[in-house]
């Protein structure tokens, strides 16, 4: 059986997540993935997606959230900069596949945020905004809206995350146009 | 639990090929990316190979690369490595790892099988 | 490729005081690392990764910091079982991955 397994992140305030979502090079390449996050009690809620088709490599910046499609290697990054207390909670990787339901990928990231000074460039105790660098051709891509009613039971993203600072210079805001999609066993 | 468990080494002349095998169980194989790390002796780790869960995407350290080709069978739970034209310096302990659920560092490791290559 | 150095080859301490072992990559890594330890005739083991995060069943007197090129492992009291060899390894979005040379810590 396949077992829902989670991956812990602890990070502090104004660091940043970054995780690799591993997906089957053949099937998946140009599909369209998001990155959502799972709150108790509540339908998994899409926070940003890719292009449709997905584009190679293509930044797709949605507010403090950055997705990066890598074809060749099989691989979504994901990055959430400037992380808040807020921002604590369980996240996955699904790729959309209509008319069928998304496929969700393997581990969920649990995400810790505590306040606190991180130590990472760019950040410190009394900034409240932050300035990080991202790839200066970003793109905001719309996420489809499934109205299925139907909970999640299937297994987990696989991820393949670790902790960085971005590469190149931009402004980042609060996550914006969040949408509600639940995902389906 | 997870348990990862390696077969295949022993001596074979420089040249040579040898097949590395690693039975995993007590996690979802399929799912998660698998690696061959490798130590000669008195010396430190060396990546060697990583195929991801699908076996859809393969990557090599290019002291190998052409040489020797990963490989896994997710219906039986099992990777291999298969070693072909063996040089002295591949002599090593080689473990088979699993890859993190979240990045490409080794959460879990076998106990390592010895190969050694000498004339 | 990214040039994982460590640093000391060898510390020396004694049962119950710190140990400082630090890590250096040649090019930013950002917080892409981790730390193994390996007793004689044993497989590597995972500390840390993250650069911070303790993995599962990793007592709290190992600690990772550092994030770009420096980066510190910690083990705040030294018991007699954490005398061993310890590696750092970064893992930035592509390979190869690359592991340090190692540090020895030995009892003084």
């Known amino acids: 059986a396949t077992k829902l397994t989670e991956e812990k992140y602890e990070l502090k305030e104004g660091q940043t997540l970054d995780v690799k979502c591993d997906y089957t090079l053949e099937k998946f390449a140009s599909s369209q993935k998001a990155w959502q996050i799972i709150r108790d009690g509540e339908m998994p809620k899409t926070l940003a997606c890719t292009e449709r088709p997905s584009k190679n490599s293509h930044p797709v910046q949605v507010g403090r959230i950055i997705l990066e499609d890598y074809h060749d290697h099989g691989l979504l990054r994901v990055r959430m900069v400037n992380l808040q207390v807020e921002d604590s909670g369980l996240y996955q990787c699904v790729i959309y596949q209509p008319p069928k339901e998304p496929h969700m990928l393997f581990d969920r990231i649990r995400l810790v945020v505590t306040k606190g000074f991180s130590g990472t460039p760019g950040s410190n105790e009394n900034s409240t905004q932050n300035v990080y660098k991202i790839p200066p051709t970003t793109t905001k891509a719309l996420c489809p809206l499934y109205t299925s009613p139907r909970t999640v039971t299937q297994a987990p993203p696989k991820s393949t995350a670790d902790v960085s600072t971005p590469d190149s210079e931009i402004n980042l805001t609060n996550v914006t146009d969040i949408i509600r999609v639940p995902v389906f066993n | 639990e997870v348990q990862l468990l390696e077969s295949g080494g022993g001596l074979v002349q420089p040249g040579g090929s040898l097949r590395l095998s690693c039975a995993a169980s007590?996690?979802?194989?399929?799912?998660?990316?698998m690696s061959w790390v490798r130590q000669a002796p008195g010396k430190g780790l060396e990546w060697v190979s990583t195929?991801?869960?699908?076996?859809?995407?393969?990557y090599y350290a290019d002291s190998v690369k052409g040489r020797f080709t990963i490989s896994r069978d997710n219906s039986k739970n099992t990777l291999d490595l298969q070693m072909n034209s063996l040089r002295a310096e591949d002599t090593a302990v080689y473990y088979c790892a699993k890859v993190a659920g979240s990045n490409f560092f080794f959460d879990h490791w076998g106990q390592g099988t010895l190969v050694t290559v000498s004339s | 490729e990214i040039v994982m150095t460590q640093s000391p080859a060898t510390l020396s301490v004694s049962p119950g005081e710190r140990a400082t072992l630090s890590c250096r990559a040649s090019?930013?890594?950002?917080?892409?690392l981790a730390w193994y330890q390996q007793k004689p005739g044993q497989a590597p083991r995972l500390l840390i990764y993250g650069a911070y995060t303790r993995a599962t069943g990793i007592p709290d007197r190992f600690s990772g910091s550092g994030s770009g090129t420096e980066f510190t492992l910690t083990i705040s009291s030294l018991q007699s079982e954490d005398f061993a060899v310890y590696y750092c390894?970064?893992?930035?979005?592509?390979?190869?991955?690359?592991f340090g040379q190692g540090t020895k810590v030995e009892i003084k």
């Open positions: 390894q970064e893992f930035i979005l592509f390979p190869p991955w690359t």
């Open positions: 007590g996690f979802t194989f399929n799912a998660y990316a």
């Open positions: 195929i991801s869960g699908s076996g859809s995407t393969t």
């Open positions: 090019q930013s890594i950002n917080a892409n």
